[in-house]
């Protein structure tokens, strides 16, 4: 009778992460008597995946009933595959021995490769706000994909960006990979409604590329422009002076009126109007009693926007 052979018909198997891998193995004879074991890798450091005789292997099921006397099919299924399961799996026949079973013959091995989708890209912007004309950096990260080949693109409002640097790690062979990219974006005054998008494409993605977004409203600070104007006299001895605070973002703003350097009133922007570009306008007025002043009055509108140093605009009120 011919000596038992262990047949692993599949040289290689490709499985998607999360799915079940079937590793096929048959023996050509029932003799010698003894169990089958599955290992990942060869040599002394090999990892036991399944032992027919003993042990608990919750992710492994056998394709056929190994308790049947005439069974020669030793194929297994491994559930919920992850990239970490990649490697070469060997079906090994043992001969019954005392006290221990003795390794008799091994199959040629089946290489299990795993394809895994990239995680949803996460885009993060700078910790502090920046003003128009400044260049800010955005990072995009995605993890856990295999194989290594991946494309990453950056867009601002649908226009592709070119100033970015991308790294895929690790550089050498690995079960899965990560991508990290940093893009530089020049802010403009119109960017309150703008979005920066990181787009990742990979062989495993059946839909469109995965996208991560960042709203520039969380990054930009548009400082206000101030204009102080004197309105016609409203009533006897009263002058209305207005301070127009235009095109600012975000809304957080405090305004202080000074009369000849002395604080007259402080208020916080509340009923603002929003511009089409997402910036805000606000107006504050001060009624000045001219009769209370002998000399000309210097009125100052002082604005502290989003915790930044105050900006101010003055107006000289003539007392005739």
């Amino acid at each position: 009778e011919e000596e038992l052979q262990v047949i692993q018909p599949d040289k290689s198997v490709l499985v998607a992460a999360g799915e079940t891998a079937t590793l096929r193995c048959t023996a050509t004879s029932l003799i010698p008597v003894g169990p089958i074991q599955w290992f990942r890798g060869a040599g002394p450091g090999r990892e036991l995946i399944y032992n027919q005789k003993e042990g608990h292997f919750p992710r492994v099921t056998t394709v056929s009933d190994l308790t049947k006397r005439n069974n020669m099919d030793f194929s297994i299924r491994i559930g919920n595959i992850t990239p970490a399961d990649a490697g070469t799996y060997y079906c090994v026949k043992f001969r019954k021995g005392s006290p221990d079973d003795v390794e008799f013959k091994s199959g040629a091995g089946t290489e299990l490769s795993v394809r895994a989708k990239p995680s949803a890209p996460v885009v993060s912007g700078p910790a502090a706000r920046a003003t128009p004309q400044h260049t800010v950096s955005f990072t995009c990260e995605s993890h856990g994909f295999s194989p290594r080949d991946i494309t990453l693109k950056w867009f601002k409002n649908g226009n592709e960006l070119s100033d970015f640097q991308t790294n895929v790690d690790p550089v050498g062979e690995s079960v899965s990979y990560s991508i990290h990219s940093t893009a530089k974006v020049v802010l403009t005054r119109e960017d309150v409604h703008s979005q920066v998008i990181c787009e990742v494409a990979h062989v495993t993605l059946q839909g469109d590329p995965l996208r991560g977004t960042a709203n520039l409203s969380e990054t930009i600070r548009v400082p206000p422009t101030l204009e102080v104007t004197q309105q016609p006299v409203r009533a006897e001895n009263q002058v209305n002076v207005t301070c127009q605070v235009r095109k600012f973002y975000p809304q957080r703003l405090q305004l202080t009126w000074l009369e000849n350097g002395n604080v007259s009133r402080t208020e916080t922007a509340s009923t603002v109007t929003e511009n089409k570009d997402g910036t805000y306008n606000w107006m504050s007025w001060l009624l000045v009693n001219v009769s209370a002043h002998r000399d000309d009055v210097k009125l100052t509108c002082q604005v502290e926007h989003d915790g930044q140093p105050a900006v101010s605009k003055s107006h000289d009120l003539k007392v005739s």
Epitope: R115, D149, T151
Partner: antibody
Framework: VQLVESGGRLGQPGTSLTLSCTVS????????MGWFRQAPGKGLEYIGI?????SPYYASWVNGRFTISKTSTTMDLKMNSLRSEDTATYFC?????????????WGPGTLVTVSS | DIQMTQSPSSLSASVGDRVTITCRAS??????LAWYQQKPGKAPKLLIY???FLYSGVPSRFSGSGSGTDFTLTISSLQPEDFATYYC???????????FGQGTKVEIK
């Protein structure tokens, strides 16, 4: 799992024609689908794909003359300004479950003949 | 666009012969290569994907190898039902586009 193309016929140069690919046994919202063609006695040529979410992508030679769209159970190929060189068998195919780099299920094809 | 050059364009062989078909890409496509078999009047059938993985139900006499730019389809022992035309197909992960080789017709000697 099955794909069947329909709509192939004799068409006049300069006219339009829409081919359909009807699928059964799986959902079009889960897979990338593709259109290919093969002129008589020639090799296979890629036309374009439509993603599971409905975005079309085309071969560089298409130049806006063909449009791929889909509903829940059919994928369409609209061909405008037909030319004699569009005479071919048109195939639809589904990409494999492991990735978009290969096509594991193909329809039998539908013949389009462009002639005056 | 990537060009795929298949060779030979045709070959004559006998049942039982070992047959090798090669496919060369104009630039690296890593392992994104598939092989199809097509018979006259029929749709292509997938044989090999990702350069070396045998598609379900395909006889084990078919095998694929290669990566980068050079790929091979081997039929270890040609059977009567294997007389057909074979195509390689690449996928480029950057352009996300597909290209076919011009085909290899395997005929009976």
């Amino acid at each position: 799992v099955q794909l069947v193309e329909s709509g192939g016929r004799l068409g006049q140069p300069g006219t339009s024609l829409t081919l359909s690919c009807t699928v059964s046994g799986f959902s079009l919202s889960s897979y990338v689908m593709g259109w290919f063609r093969q002129a008589p006695g020639k090799g296979l040529e890629y036309i374009g794909i439509i993603s599971s979410s409905g975005s079309p992508y085309y071969a560089s030679w298409v130049n806006g003359r063909f449009t791929i769209s889909k509903t829940s159970t059919t994928m369409d190929l609209k061909m405008n300004s037909l030319r004699s060189e569009d005479t071919a068998t048109y195939f639809c195919a589904r990409v494999g479950p492991l990735g978009v780099d290969y096509f594991n299920i193909w329809g039998p094809g539908t013949l389009v003949t462009v002639s005056s | 666009d990537i060009q795929m050059t298949q060779s030979p364009s045709s070959l004559s062989a006998s049942v039982g012969d070992r047959v090798t078909i090669t496919c060369r890409a104009s630039q690296s496509i890593n392992s994104y290569l598939a092989w199809y078999q097509q018979k006259p009047g029929k749709a292509p059938k997938l044989l090999i994907y990702s350069a070396s993985f045998l598609y379900s139900g395909v006889p084990s006499r078919f095998s694929g190898s290669g990566s980068g730019t050079d790929f091979t389809l081997t039929i270890s022992s040609l059977q009567p039902e294997d007389f057909a035309t074979y195509y390689c197909q690449s996928w480029h992960y950057i352009s996300r586009s597909y290209t076919f080789g011009q085909g290899t017709k395997v005929e009976i000697k």
